[in-house]
């Protein structure tokens, strides 16, 4: 989990001759704000829905009134940071779209009048952890300035946001193959309940045992480069899992929706549809008139002069919604069978299939355990002539659609602390214990007797890859 | 490829002490903790104990007693595993193998070293 | 320590045959791994956490149990299952072995 940050630096006339007209006048005062949508993956058809990583409305600027015979200069910028937080691995390639939008101030009939000023968009490779990435778009006449970038949130850490940190009881010490998180010193990294060898530079996993690959990367362990022309083929960050998936908490846990709001998972991440009134990525924000520009991708909004009057969002082709904020969705028809996950690329449906089973709509099954659903990722098991699900970290029950406790079954030994993660259960070990489990007691060579580590021996930690 | 490559076959006389090496290589050896097993001639295994090698934090199997010390050598992916004061019935197979923990923290050891004779005679 | 008990310790079959091996720990181990050992040979890595199939292990074998009681099922023998399997516990310290049961040609 973690939050993209951009940071609106200049909007006003780019250089050379042309240079447009101020769009605020003494007789129409203006003030600016910005949208901003992020997709995963380096391709426009990499995102499933229209935001997928998530989208964030700026405040309005200040109130700008052009003077007369002056140039246009750069106009003022609203206060602070952008901000969309991301509740999934920082996919290490993504797609933007900044819009300007110009709130007009005069006196016409309705309020205010919004209008789009600007429309910029781009790909970028960019890390979580890393430094402000500076960068300068333009549309038109007009020139952007901004700086971006990614940042975990606390306990996660790394490239990805996929790696998680906690706190050591020794210093100096961490476990094999485990640095000390910078900055947080005194803490090291949890481990990875990756794929063995699954590249820590270039894959990650939200899941135990599996090995996603960042965009431009590809293999089963995310080793091998793709070439630049398929880095732009019609594909997210790849997965190449074996073993048990394993998912953490759905992001719809919770419900993270508002005043009302009904939450429905996307591939990456989760989607609020919100009552009318209400819009923003939860649904929060509130009173809502058509003088606050409602109405997303283009709709055309009628009535609601006054917030306790809805409004109406008459959406273009293509978008739907109250606040014309989802594309239409034509894999709600459902049309992948026994399971398969529906990708609309916008010229076509495809079905990425279950293990078990194939064909354009996954309708042929190719082995007798997949006709036993087992829930939230379990893996059919057969044994003695009988299926059954062996569950996923997190569930249980005959089909595993019971939500369990990871920490119930206590599987930290010897008084270590068992925290459930996304990417898997990790146990903190008292002092004097080693392993994963914290199942070994740790003995000083010569004194294998002894049943603990004596004061100050920081013990050993789990291995990083699972 | 993952592979463990032990040291060769060694006779030790009542007493001495024998140190077989375990070179890793395919992955990287400080990731997975690496344990030593032994198998004396028609019998079942024997955990030895377990070393982390990033670390050098190890835990032995109460029955050796203190005659067990498991060392690595980091910079060139080996581990060590050194028993003294050896007696015939140690006459066995030692194996290196390395620990793997699955999603829910199972334990198991996912790829072993060919074995070394280690035979005890007077 | 705790102690893993195999049944049976040998047994002969013939090829296409359904075996089942059974092990028994003394105490609850949450868990176990499967083993099969060849002659001269190192053991190898059939199956973990009860029931999960090591990468490269045919379907033919199973795993299944909880607790204290665990099954390795060969659901159809061919030439090349003819060795010596082994369960092991890795839940409790100091980690422990089966005996062993040795599958030979009937």
């Known amino acids: 989990a973690g939050v993209f940050e951009l940071q609106i630096h200049s909007f006003g006339p780019g250089p050379g001759p042309g240079a447009p007209r101020s769009p605020c006048s003494a007789r129409l005062p203006c003030r600016l704000f910005f949208r901003v949508c992020l997709k995963p993956g380096l391709s426009e058809e990499a995102a499933e829905s229209p935001c997928a990583l998530g989208a964030a409305l700026s405040a309005r600027g200040p109130v700008y009134t052009e003077q007369p015979g002056a140039p246009a200069p750069d106009l003022p910028l609203p206060d602070g940071l952008l901000q969309v937080p991301f509740r999934d691995a920082w996919p290490g390639t993504f797609s933007f779209i900044i819009e300007t939008w110009r709130e007009e101030l005069g006196d016409q009939i309705g309020g205010p009048a919004w209008s789009l000023l600007a429309r910029v968009a781009g790909r970028r490779r960019l890390a979580a952890g890393g430094p402000w990435a500076r960068d300068i778009q333009r549309a038109g006449a007009w020139e952007l300035r901004f700086s971006y970038r990614a940042r975990c949130e606390p306990p996660a850490v790394g490239t990805a946001c996929t790696r998680l940190c906690r706190p050591r009881s020794a210093p100096s010490r961490c476990g094999p193959g485990l640095r000390p998180c910078a900055p947080l010193e005194d803490e090291c990294e949890a481990p990875l309940v990756c794929r063995a060898g699954c590249s820590p530079e270039h894959g990650f996993c939200e899941q135990p045992g599996e090995c996603r690959c960042l965009e431009g990367w590809t293999g089963p362990l995310c080793t091998v480069p793709v070439s630049t022309s398929s880095c732009l083929s019609p594909r997210g960050p790849s997965s190449a899992t074996t073993g048990c998936l394993v998912p953490g908490p759905g992001p719809c846990d919770g419900n993270p929706c508002a005043n009302g709001g009904s939450c429905s998972e996307t591939p990456r991440s989760f989607e609020c549809t919100c009552p009318r009134g209400f819009y923003g990525l939860r649904c929060e924000v509130s009173g809502v008139t058509c003088a606050d520009g409602p109405c997303f991708n283009g709709g055309l909004c009628v009535g609601g002069a006054d917030p306790d009057s809805a409004y109406i969002c008459h959406c273009p082709p293509g978008f739907q919604g109250s606040n014309c904020e989802k594309r239409v969705d034509r894999c709600s028809l459902q049309p992948c069978r026994n399971g398969g996950l529906c990708l609309d690329l916008g010229h076509a449906l495809r079905c990425r299939c279950r293990a078990g089973f194939a064909g354009p709509r996954c309708e042929h099954d190719l082995d007798d355990c997949a006709g036993r659903a087992c829930a939230n990722g379990g893996t059919c098991v057969e044994g003695g002539g009988a299926h059954r699900c062996s569950c996923a970290l997190g569930f249980g029950g005959r089909d595993c659609r019971e939500r369990a406790d990871p920490c119930a079954a206590r599987p930290c030994a010897h008084g270590g602390r068992c925290y459930a993660h996304f990417s898997g259960l990790v146990c903190a070990c008292a002092p004097g214990y080693m392993g994963a489990r914290c199942e070994f007691p740790v003995h000083p060579d010569g004194a294998s007797a002894l049943p603990a580590a004596p004061p100050g021996l920081r013990p050993g930690d789990p291995q990083r890859y699972l | 490829e993952v592979r463990l490559v032990q040291s060769g076959a060694e006779v030790k006389k009542p007493g001495a002490s024998v140190k077989v090496s375990c070179k890793a290589s395919g992955y990287t050896f400080t990731d997975y903790y690496m344990n030593w097993v032994r198998q004396a001639p028609g019998q079942s295994l024997e955990w030895m104990g377990i070393?982390?090698?990033?670390?050098?934090?190890?835990s032995y199997n109460q029955k050796f007693r203190g005659r067990v010390t498991l060392t690595v050598d980091k910079s060139a992916s080996t581990a060590y595993m050194e028993l003294s004061s050896l007696r015939s019935e140690d006459t066995a197979v030692y194996y290196c193998?390395?620990?793997?923990?699955?999603?829910?923290?199972?334990?198991?050891?996912?790829?072993w070293g060919q074995g070394t004779t280690v035979t005890v005679s007077s | 320590d705790i102690q893993m008990t195999q049944s049976p310790s040998s047994l002969s079959a013939s090829v296409g045959d359904r075996v089942t091996i059974t092990c028994k720990a003394s105490?609850?181990?949450?868990?176990v791994s499967w083993y099969q050992q060849k002659p001269g040979k190192a053991p190898k890595l059939l199956i973990y956490?009860?029931?999960n199939r090591y990468t490269g292990v045919p379907s033919r074998f199973s795993g299944s149990g909880s607790g204290t009681d665990f099954t390795l099922t060969i659901s159809s023998l061919q030439p090349e299952d003819f060795a010596t399997y082994y369960c092991?516990?890795?839940?409790?310290?100091?980690?422990?072995f089966g005996q062993g049961t040795k599958l030979e040609i009937k």
């Open positions: 105490e609850n181990v949450g868990y």
């Open positions: 070393i982390n090698p990033y670390t050098g934090d190890t």
């Open positions: 193998a390395r620990y793997h923990y699955g999603p829910h923290l199972e334990g198991y050891f996912d790829v």
């Open positions: 956490g009860a029931s």
């Open positions: 092991g516990q890795s839940y409790s310290y100091p980690l422990t």
